[in-house]
Interface confidence: medium
């Protein structure tokens, strides 16, 4: 229903505690340079007509659409060409032009250091002074660094860590408790991060449509007891709250969020036997719950699949006559009876399918043409399940840190022109999908490791877009967004990359890496070993082992030396020969 | 648009029975809800019965203990058999589902006339 004043309308569905954090993440997304206390300054501001506009709907500006309303203030910034550059041209355009224009300059690897997580004690000083500014601050950095980051679900680690450290600060030894504690959060913050991005990379890409079958098949495997038309129903909600999200409409896409969690708590008879848990919860944590709820028990009598897609002879009929409903349901079926495949599996398969009936269905016995496709499906299962078999294996065998390093050779040779920071944070992510995935049970396997997979090859095609020096990885992140995953997996050595020319300075060190953390000394290390195989992108693995190994060996000599710079002066250059040497 | 196709409407005696058939595609039959309405002259078109694809079934007050919704998988029919028929139950019965991605879809409807 039309409201007069939108962002009366809002706040008054939101309250005020939520609709501050989400106008907060909404200005740290759109301008991700300015500091905390302007933004803030401007949330107040907002807040404040806001709430003008709940006492008398018809008040000045009060029927202007959000869009206009933060536009106007983002615009109204002192010196924002001088901090922004050509973001201030945006101004000068109308809406929903200057709303698009804002979007395509939000920037996915600003230049911002990383988030520095302050000392335990020092961090609940600050927190018991003020927790409502200490949290703001915890949105401010997490939604700037991340400008496309789920609005909704980081309000809820706000509200974890605000739980966090309201336990944690009253203990003795405050960072044994807080440590373990923020490092979960943020560990599932990340992830919650590149898992976002790939949404609205879906959506900027092929449109809702796309998105809507991807919701789809996982609305299907958590829900296999709800009907088609539930599932569609529940899909069309999260593909227009997605597209608000994606699209900067932080409060709209938050009141439509907690209106879907309603609805299914309201509706659980017709959707699972699983969700009552979630219910009881309060409408950040219900959301949450319901997002990460566990998939129900497969109805025990479903029919095989080839009766209706394969067996049944008006197929191409079905399929003439309603071709998204027969696709659909096509998709609902399968994806209902396999939640142990990956949602880019189960896509995979629908698009086979719906090949196959355009090919089939134009000939002349159809029935004889497509009557072998579930069968002609297995090449497309096989190829992930053997994926994740020999990549569980090796993160088996080497652990967490030899699997990153192993996947970094890997994809330095696959894509040598790619900047090594990029590769590095691509290998250290894609590598963690051991620790993450291989662990679980085996029907769990699939759809954690290539579903993980496709969301951080996402960031890495969005970051090349930026900056693009690699035709392969351009090749494999301009076609579809399921086939991804398999086109970097197909990838081999890049023969036409000419190789870096040896410079010693990129493997010195100084006595400065001792003092790292151990994350910090790993990422240095695997800088170096990016580099050695930029230079040598067909040395073997063992040549690799034998330098890394003496890179390990000095580093670890020289932090115990007693002068530590002398050692680093004079060991590093025979490093340097040596490894010239093995590599030659 | 998706069809579906009525039959087995006709003339009965009050106290008669009739059972009507809607043909459709199975896979629409099997994964979505599917109804039986009805529209009596002058009348506004009102829920006879609807049949969930679990087996669920739901009617109206004014059916319940006469009418018997189903359906057979194997033949692609959804089935509404009508027993105790009363002068009230005549109007033209549609058969009806709502496809998702797409607007309602209804049968052309068949005529059941209860009289004597």
């Known amino acids: 229903e039309a409201h007069k004043s939108e962002i009366a309308h809002r706040f008054k569905d939101l309250g005020e505690q939520h609709f501050k954090g989400l106008v907060l993440i909404a200005f740290s997304q759109y301008l991700q340079k300015c500091p905390y206390e302007e933004h803030i300054k401007l949330v107040q501001e907002v807040t404040d007509f806001a709430k003008t506009c709940v006492a008398d709907e018809n008040a000045e500006n009060c029927d202007k659409s959000i869009h206009t309303l933060f536009g106007d203030k983002l615009c109204a910034i002192p010196k924002l060409r001088d901090n922004y550059g050509e973001l201030a041209d945006c101004c000068a355009k109308q809406e929903p032009e200057r709303n698009e224009c804002f979007l395509q300059h939000k920037d996915d690897n600003p230049n911002l250091p990383p988030f520095q997580r302050p000392e335990a004690e020092a961090m609940c000083t600050s927190f018991q002074e003020n927790p409502t500014s200490f949290l703001g601050h915890y949105l401010h950095e997490v939604a700037r660094r991340h400008p496309y980051f789920y609005a909704p679900e980081l309000l809820y680690y706000a509200e974890k860590y605000n739980e966090v450290l309201t336990q944690c600060c009253t203990e003795s030894d405050k960072a044994a408790c807080l440590t373990p504690k923020l490092d979960a959060v943020k560990e599932k913050a990340l992830v919650a991060a590149v898992r976002q991005r790939m949404k609205c990379s879906s959506m900027q890409r092929f449109g809702e449509r796309a998105f809507k079958a991807w919701a789809v098949a996982r609305m299907s495997q958590r829900f296999p007891n709800a009907e088609f038309a539930e599932i569609t129903k529940l899909a069309t909600d999260v593909t227009k709250i997605n597209k608000e999200c994606c699209h900067g409409d932080l409060l709209e896409c938050a009141d439509d969020r907690a209106e879907l969690a309603k609805y299914m708590c309201e509706n659980q008879a017709t959707i699972s036997s699983k969700l009552q848990a979630c219910c009881d919860k309060p409408v950040l944590q219900k959301s949450q719950c319901l997002a990460e709820i566990e998939h129900d028990n497969i109805p025990a009598d479903l029919p095989s699949i080839a009766a209706d897609f394969v067996e049944d002879k008006e197929v191409c009929k079905n399929y003439a006559e309603a071709k998204d409903v027969f696709l659909g349901t096509f998709l609902y079926e399968y994806s209902r009876r396999h939640p142990d495949y990956s949602v880019s599996l189960l896509l995979r398969l629908a698009k086979k399918y719906e090949a196959t009936l355009e090919k089939c269905c134009a000939e002349g016995d159809p029935p004889a043409c497509y009557g072998t496709v579930l069968a002609e499906f297995q090449p497309l299962v096989e190829e992930p399940k053997n994926l994740v078999k020999t990549n569980c294996e090796l993160y088996e065998k080497l652990g967490e840190y030899g699997f990153q390093n192993a996947v970094l050779v890997r994809y330095t040779q696959k894509a040598p022109q790619v900047s090594t920071p990029t590769l590095v944070e691509a290998a250290r992510n894609l590598g963690r999908v051991g620790t993450k995935c291989c662990t679980l049970p085996e029907a769990q396997r699939l759809p954690c490791v290539e579903d993980y997979l496709s969301a951080i090859l996402n960031r890495l095609c969005v970051l090349h877009e930026k900056t693009p020096v690699s035709e392969k990885v351009t090749k494999c992140c301009s076609g579809s967004l399921v086939e991804r995953r398999p086109c970097f997996s197909a990838l081999t050595v890049d023969e036409t990359y000419v190789p870096k020319e040896f410079k010693a300075e990129t493997f010195t060190f100084h006595s400065d890496i001792c003092t790292l953390p151990d994350k910090e000394k790993q990422i240095k290390k695997q800088t170096a070993l990016a580099e050695l195989v930029k230079h040598k992108p067909k040395a073997t693995e063992d040549q690799l082992k034998t330098v890394m190994g003496d890179f390990a060996q000095f580093v670890d000599k020289c932090c115990k030396a007693a002068d530590k710079d002398n050692c680093f002066a004079t060991e590093g250059p025979n490093l340097v020969a040596r490894s010239k040497e093995a590599l030659a | 648009q998706v069809q579906l196709v009525e039959s087995g409407g006709g003339l009965v005696q009050p106290g008669g029975s009739l059972r009507l058939s809607c043909a459709g595609p199975?896979?629409?039959?099997?994964?979505?809800?599917m109804g039986w309405y009805r529209q009596a002259p002058g009348k506004e078109r009102e829920l006879v019965a609807f049949i969930r694809p679990s087996g669920l079934t739901n009617y109206n007050d004014a059916v319940q203990g006469r009418f018997t919704i189903s359906r057979d998988n194997s033949k692609n029919t959804l089935y509404l058999q009508m027993n105790s028929l009363r002068a009230e139950d005549t109007a033209v019965y549609y058969c009806?589902?709502?496809?998702?991605?797409?607007?309602?879809?209804w049968g052309q409807g068949t005529l059941v006339t209860v009289s004597s």
């Open positions: 199975g896979f629409l039959l099997r994964s979505n809800t």
């Open positions: 009806h589902t709502r496809p998702p991605f797409q607007r309602d879809s």
